[in-house]
Interface confidence: medium
């Protein structure tokens, strides 16, 4: 019921061995079951965490410590709302070679969602 | 205010079963993972596994599948931790530990503020 | 199963730099996390995201992470430091946690 998705930020472009942690919105759903997509495949083994906003509205992270080329592509997040999939817009994730000055397209984050994660 | 309350300390026989509980308060309990960790007496501390209350979903380390199982009430607000057949190398502290924020099932990242007071188990013949 | 290595012990003086390593394969893709444990008492997060500290803990605990290596350093070690210590991170296919042995910190 009403239920909104966003992936941000649209396009992200870091140095190769930085940290990303990229996120995403869900609103109209109680308890999400977030999944991350790259390239069109579920990720796996990678840590992911949710933060409820409210009772209705959780920010799903995806993080990752140190980013290699193999990391580079298109992420989207994917929820399953009443038997539908529910999926964001893409966000695009480009390298430039380590210590290469990288512009960063960041979504606002608010201080409270700045928490710990495992992946570099 | 966030309290993690553990039962009592209890003493077992080798091929006893037991329950120990960990009942929470002070947050939703739902929102949060509750995890196990053991300390042998004098020794490190080992992460068993952990529960996401709201959907059951459970992890367990390596070490620990299959030996306990990890549950959890929603209507207490109460995580469990048991065993069907104890050995004399459970004997232990054992911690129920609150991890900081809401996660997600698969592969969770834990950031832990709030540990109870542990749980002395011991087992002997 | 993926083991997180730290030395047994380590002793300084007073007003010295102690510093405790762990090591284990899969620390250049996670986060290593430490906690500080004293006697009788519950563990204490200390750092976190290899080298955030947390809110409360002194300015003379710090980390750091290189390669396979996470480091706790405590500059000017103090008595009340005395402690356990023990890294914390994840498996490499983060589907399980890890302790390390931990470190018994002497400040003699």
């Known amino acids: 019921a009403g239920l909104k998705l966003m992936g941000a930020p649209v396009k992200l472009t870091v140095s190769q061995g930085q940290p990303v942690k990229l996120n995403c919105s869900v609103e109209g759903m109680e308890e999400p079951d977030i999944q991350w997509v790259k390239d069109g495949a579920v990720v796996q083994n990678l840590d992911q965490l949710y933060i409820p906003v409210s009772e209705q509205h959780w920010i799903g992270f995806l993080s990752l410590k140190s980013v290699e080329r193999s990391d580079a592509g298109r992420y989207w997040c994917q929820v399953e709302d009443g038997g539908e999939t529910e999926i964001s817009q893409p966000v695009w994730l480009t390298l430039v070679p380590r210590g290469s000055s990288a512009h960063h397209h960041h979504h606002h984050h608010h201080s409270a969602w700045s928490h710990p994660q495992f992946e570099k | 205010e966030v309290q993690l309350v553990q039962s009592g300390a209890d003493v077992k026989k080798p091929g006893a079963s037991l329950t120990i509980s960990c009942q929470a308060s002070?947050?939703?309990?739902?929102?949060?993972?509750i995890s196990w960790v053991r300390q042998k007496p004098g020794k490190g501390l080992e992460w068993m596994g952990r529960?996401?209350?709201?959907?059951?979903?459970?992890m367990y380390g390596p070490s620990f599948q299959g030996h306990v199982t990890i549950s959890a009430d929603r209507s207490t607000a109460t995580a469990y931790l048991q065993w069907r057949s104890l050995e004399a190398s459970d004997t232990a502290m054992y911690y129920c530990?609150?991890?900081?924020?809401?996660?997600?099932?698969?592969?969770?990242?834990?950031?832990?503020?709030?540990w109870g007071p542990g749980t002395l188990v011991t087992v002997s013949s | 199963s993926y083991e997180l290595t730290q030395p047994p012990s380590v002793s300084v003086s007073p007003g010295q730099t102690a510093r405790i390593t762990c090591s284990g394969d899969a620390l250049p893709k996670k986060y290593a996390y430490w906690y500080q444990q004293k006697s009788g008492q519950a563990p204490v997060l200390v750092i976190y995201?290899?080298?955030k500290r947390v809110s409360g803990i002194p300015e003379r605990f710090s980390g750091s992470s290189s390669g396979t290596m996470a480091t706790l350093t405590i500059s000017g070690a103090q008595v009340e430091d005395e402690a356990d210590y023990y890294c914390?991170?994840?498996?490499?296919?983060?589907?399980?946690?890890?302790f390390g042995g931990g470190t018994k910190l002497t400040v003699l």
């Open positions: 002070g947050y939703t309990f739902t929102d949060y993972w």
């Open positions: 530990v609150r991890s900081w924020l809401a996660t997600s099932g698969g592969t969770i990242p834990e950031y832990y503020q709030h």
């Open positions: 529960i996401r209350p709201l959907l059951s979903h459970t």
């Open positions: 914390y991170s994840a498996s490499a296919n983060g589907n399980y946690r890890v």
């Open positions: 995201e290899d080298a």
